[in-house]
C-alpha cells in the first residue's frame, strides 16, 4: 500500500506525459488523478515507466474500478497489462479482437503467462467458439496455442477455422488433440484436389483412421517418414505392405532406419516376412512363413 502524502507544489499532473517518467512512487500516488489516468491510458505506453511505477498506476485504476476495468481502459493498458493478475483479468469482459491483439502485443516474444492464458480463456468463452479471426490472431502470437487446448475445448473449433492453422501450430499436439482436429480438417479441405488436399491435411494425419490412410495410399501422395512416424499406431497396423509402399512411395526406404521405433516396429510384427521381403529393405521381425495369424479381437467380437 502506498502511503498517502500531499503532492509537492508544481508537481500535480495535468496530463499523462513524459514529465512523470522519474516521479517517485509516492509522487505518482499523490500527484496523478485516477480519472485522468483512465481517460489518458493510451499515453502510458509511450512513457517508459518502471515496474514499480506501473504498480502505482495499477493501484489507482483498481481503486477507480473495483468491479473490473471497462474495455475502453483495457484496450489501452499496454505495459500495465504485465502487472495484472489472473484474478484481475477474470473481472473483465473483453469482446473486441483489437483489444485482445493490443494486449498480446505487450507480451510478444515471451512465453504464454497465466495472465495471457486467462485473457484468452475469457475472450474465447465470451465469443462462444474459437472463430477463424481469433484463431488467426492467437496462433500468430503463440504458434503452440492450439495444442495447449484440451480435446473438449478443441471441439468448439469450427472447421472453417482450420484454414488458419499452419503445420508448426500442431507441432506439440498429442494424438488425442489430433483425433479431434483431423475430422474438422478433412471437412474443411474436402473440396480440394488430391495433391493440394494432401499438402493441407498432412499436418493433421496423426488423427487419421486406417480407412483414410488406405484411401491416401491410392493417390500417389509420397508421404514422408516424419509424417508416417506421427500416425496413430492403431491406424497403421492394419495396412498391408503394398499399401504402405504406395503411401510412402520413394520414401519407403526410410522404413529401415525406423524399424525399431513405433509405429514401424509394431507394424512389422503384424506383417508376413514374405511380404516384407518384397520391399528389399532387409526388414526383420515379420510373421514367419507357414504361420497362421488369428485375429483374436475379431473372434471376441463375433462371439
Amino acid at each position: 500500500e502506498v502511503e498517502k502524502t500531499a503532492c509537492p507544489s508544481g508537481k500535480k499532473a495535468r496530463e499523462i506525459d513524459e514529465s512523470l517518467i522519474f516521479y517517485k512512487k509516492w509522487e505518482l500516488e499523490a500527484c496523478v488523478d485516477a480519472a485522468l489516468l483512465a481517460t489518458q491510458m493510451d499515453r502510458v505506453n509511450a512513457i517508459p515507466f518502471t515496474y514499480e511505477q506501473l504498480d502505482v498506476l495499477k493501484h489507482k485504476l483498481d481503486e477507480l474500478y473495483p468491479q473490473g476495468y471497462p474495455e475502453s481502459v483495457i484496450q489501452h493498458l499496454g505495459y500495465l497489462f504485465l502487472k495484472m493478475s489472473p484474478e484481475d483479468i477474470r473481472k473483465w469482459n473483453v469482446t473486441s479482437l483489437e483489444t485482445l491483439k493490443a494486449l498480446l502485443e505487450v507480451n510478444k516474444g515471451h512465453e504464454m503467462s497465466p495472465q495471457v492464458a486467462t485473457l484468452i480463456d475469457r475472450f474465447v468463452k465470451g465469443r462462444g467458439q474459437l472463430d477463424k479471426d481469433t484463431l488467426d490472431t492467437l496462433t500468430a502470437f503463440y504458434p503452440g496455442y492450439l495444442c495447449s487446448l484440451s480435446p473438449e475445448e478443441l471441439s468448439s473449433v469450427p472447421p472453417s477455422s482450420i484454414w488458419a492453422v499452419r503445420p508448426q501450430d500442431l507441432d506439440t499436439c498429442d494424438p488425442r488433440q489430433l483425433d479431434v482436429l483431423y475430422p474438422k480438417a478433412r471437412l474443411a479441405f474436402q473440396n480440394m484436389n488430391g495433391s493440394e488436399y494432401f499438402v493441407k491435411i498432412q499436418s493433421f494425419l496423426g488423427g487419421a483412421p486406417t480407412e483414410d490412410l488406405k484411401a491416401l495410399s491410392q493417390q500417389n501422395v509420397s508421404m514422408d517418414l516424419a509424417t508416417f512416424m506421427k500416425l496413430r499406431t492403431d491406424a497403421v497396423l492394419p495396412l498391408t505392405v503394398a499399401e504402405v509402399q504406395k503411401l510412402l512411395g520413394p520414401h519407403v526406404e526410410g522404413l529401415k532406419a525406423e524399424e525399431r521405433h513405433r509405429p514401424v516396429r509394431d507394424w512389422i510384427l503384424r506383417q508376413r516376412q514374405d511380404d516384407l521381403d518384397t520391399l528389399g529393405l532387409g526388414l526383420q521381425g515379420g510373421i514367419p512363413n507357414g504361420y497362421l495369424v488369428l485375429d483374436l479381437s475379431m473372434q471376441e467380437a463375433l462371439s
Epitope: S19, I21, P48, Y79
Partner: antibody, heavy 122, light 106 residues
Framework: EVQLLESGGGLVQPGGSLRLSCAAS????????MSWVRQAPGKGLEWVSA????????YYADSVKGRFTISRDNSKNTLYLQMNSLRAEDTAVYYC???????????????WGRGTLVTVSS | IQLTQSPSSLSASVGDRVTITCRAS??????LAWYQQKPGKAPKLLIY???SLESGVPSRFSGSGSGTDFTLTISSLQPEDFATYYC?????????FGGGTKVEIK
Amino acid sequence: EVQLLESGGGLVQPGGSLRLSCAASGFTFSSYAMSWVRQAPGKGLEWVSAISGSGGSTYYADSVKGRFTISRDNSKNTLYLQMNSLRAEDTAVYYCAKRRDSYGPYWYFDLWGRGTLVTVSS
Amino acid sequence: IQLTQSPSSLSASVGDRVTITCRASQGISSALAWYQQKPGKAPKLLIYDASSLESGVPSRFSGSGSGTDFTLTISSLQPEDFATYYCQQFNNYPLTFGGGTKVEIK
C-alpha cells in the same frame, strides 16, 4: 552503424568541471531515454543519471545530485553530462548507454559507448 | 534495492558448468538483466527479464529466477566466456547493479 561514442574525459583537479559528450548514430535518438553509467577503476557499475527522450525529465543518483547535469540535443543526436564540483570519488570510466526498447518498463541497456575516463586528482 | 552477487570470483575450466547468483534486497519480480564485461570493454547485455536471451547471445547462457533470487548459468564454459558478469535490477529507480563476479581460468 548503430553506435555511441563518448568524448570529453580527462584529468581535472578536485572542485573542477568537465563536460562529457556522447554522439549517437544508427537509431532514432529522440525516441530513447538515455543514461550515463560509470565504473571506478577495478570496481563495479553505477547508474549515474538518465534523461527522457524529449529531454524534459531527468534523474540523478544521490551521489551526484546537485553537481551533475544531464542534457541532450536531439537535433545533433548528442547526449551530455556536465560535471561540476568534481571529487576524487568521481574518478571513473563514464559510459553512455541506450535502453533496449524505447517503450515499456525495460530499463536495461543493449548499446553502450566505449567509455571515456575522468580522473579527478590534484 | 541492493543486489548481492556470489561468488565474487571463481576459477573454472573450459567445458565446466558455471552458476552465478544474484540476490535482491527486496522482490523485483523478473526485472533483472545480466551483462558480461571484458577488461577495457563496455558491458554487453546477455539476459533480460531474468530469463530471456538477448539476440546473438549463445544458447549456453541462460537465466532463471524471480522475486529475490536469480541465477546466470553458463552450461559449458568457452574460452571467450572468461570475463566479469554483472546483474542489474530495473524494477525501480535508482537502477542498481550487483558487485560483479569474475570468472577466471583455472
